[in-house]
Amino acid sequence: QPDALNVPSTCCFTFSSKKISLQRLKSYVITTSRCPQKAVIFRTKLGKEICADPKEKWVQNYMKHLGRKAHTLKT
């Protein structure tokens, strides 16, 4: 899950074990190359962050639904 400890930007070191409903999400960012592993951080409608594995099909589908433009976390 996102971790700001000892890294220059938010990074995900573990992923959510739940497949979140798409309707609960409003946006996403892709973590930067400075992070040890690539990850997607979804933001929920309640303003919370959820880490997800970009290799999973549902994550890829959600990213398409939330916007085709690439979203990369700024550092």
Epitope: Q1, D3, T44, L46, E49, C51
Partner: antibody, heavy 119, light 107 residues
Framework: QVQLQESGPGLVKPSQTLSLTCTVS??????????WNWIRQHPGKGLEWIGY???????YYNPSLKSRITISIDTSKNQFSLTLSSVTAADTAVYYC???????????WGQGTMVTVSS | DIQMTQSPSSLSASVGDRVTITCQAS??????LNWYQQKPGKAPKLLIY???NLETGVPSRFSGSGSGTDFTFTINSLQPEDIATYYC?????????FGQGTKLEIK
């Protein structure tokens, strides 16, 4: 496996401030995506959500208690804390700390600590 | 705040019975509902999230359904270890609200 453990005084006098601490083990409290919550349960009653804190220090408090509560985080000790001021007998309850992974589901709980407000 | 109303407040059933608990929200909450089990003297345990998804490790005899304002929690074949109080919780809005609980006893 993340575990949570509450600690604090079991007895508090009316009008005083209640302070409780939740110690996180088996994982870093600094990990984002984890939201650290306080929830209480009055004797024989249901559950009442108090509020949460995020690793960044962002908080959200239940408006019904907002004027009396503060939730803080100490990443160096892997702990987060609740303070509740001006307590009355109505604040007598079991206080739980709990984690949610950003998905608004409390999947890990402490065992709870009973706090009695009495003179 | 959203009000969550559970019914019944208590019920008694026999081992093997199908048990149903309902939870009604005071406004539309889509499927933003969790169910918890709390055994005496213990902390609550998450059973179901998003109204119908079983949490990892939870027996398949537990299930949930519903959306909008009306939700149902079902135990298909009641076991002695299911004796507990069950709570619903909404997360459509902050602050989160819980139902008042349903206490389940064995006949």
């Amino acid at each position: 496996q993340v575990q949570l453990q509450e600690s604090g005084p079991g007895l508090v006098k009316p009008s005083q401030t209640l302070s409780l601490t939740c110690t996180v083990s088996g994982g870093s409290i600094s990990s984002g995506g984890n939201y650290w919550n306080w929830i209480r349960q009055h004797p024989g009653k249901g559950l009442e959500w108090i509020g949460y804190i995020y690793y960044s220090g962002n908080t959200y408090y239940n408006p019904s208690l907002k004027s009396r509560i503060t939730i803080s985080i100490d990443t160096s000790k892997n702990q987060f804390s609740l303070t509740l001021s001006s307590v009355t007998a109505a604040d007598t309850a079991v206080y739980y700390c709990a984690r949610d992974g950003g998905d608004d589901a409390f999947d890990i709980w402490g065992q709870g600590t009973m706090v009695t407000v009495s003179s | 705040d959203i009000q969550m109303t559970q019914s019944p407040s208590s019920l008694s059933a026999s081992v093997g019975d199908r048990v149903t608990i309902t939870c009604q929200a005071s406004q539309d909450i889509s499927n933003y509902l969790n169910w918890y089990q709390q055994k005496p003297g213990k902390a609550p345990k998450l059973l179901i999230y998003d109204a119908s998804n079983l949490e990892t490790g939870v027996p398949s005899r537990f299930s949930g359904s519903g959306s909008g304002t009306d939700f149902t929690f079902t135990i298909n074949s009641l076991q002695p270890e299911d004796i507990a109080t069950y709570y619903c919780q909404e997360y459509n809005n902050l602050p989160y609200s819980f139902g008042q609980g349903t206490k389940l006893e064995i006949k």
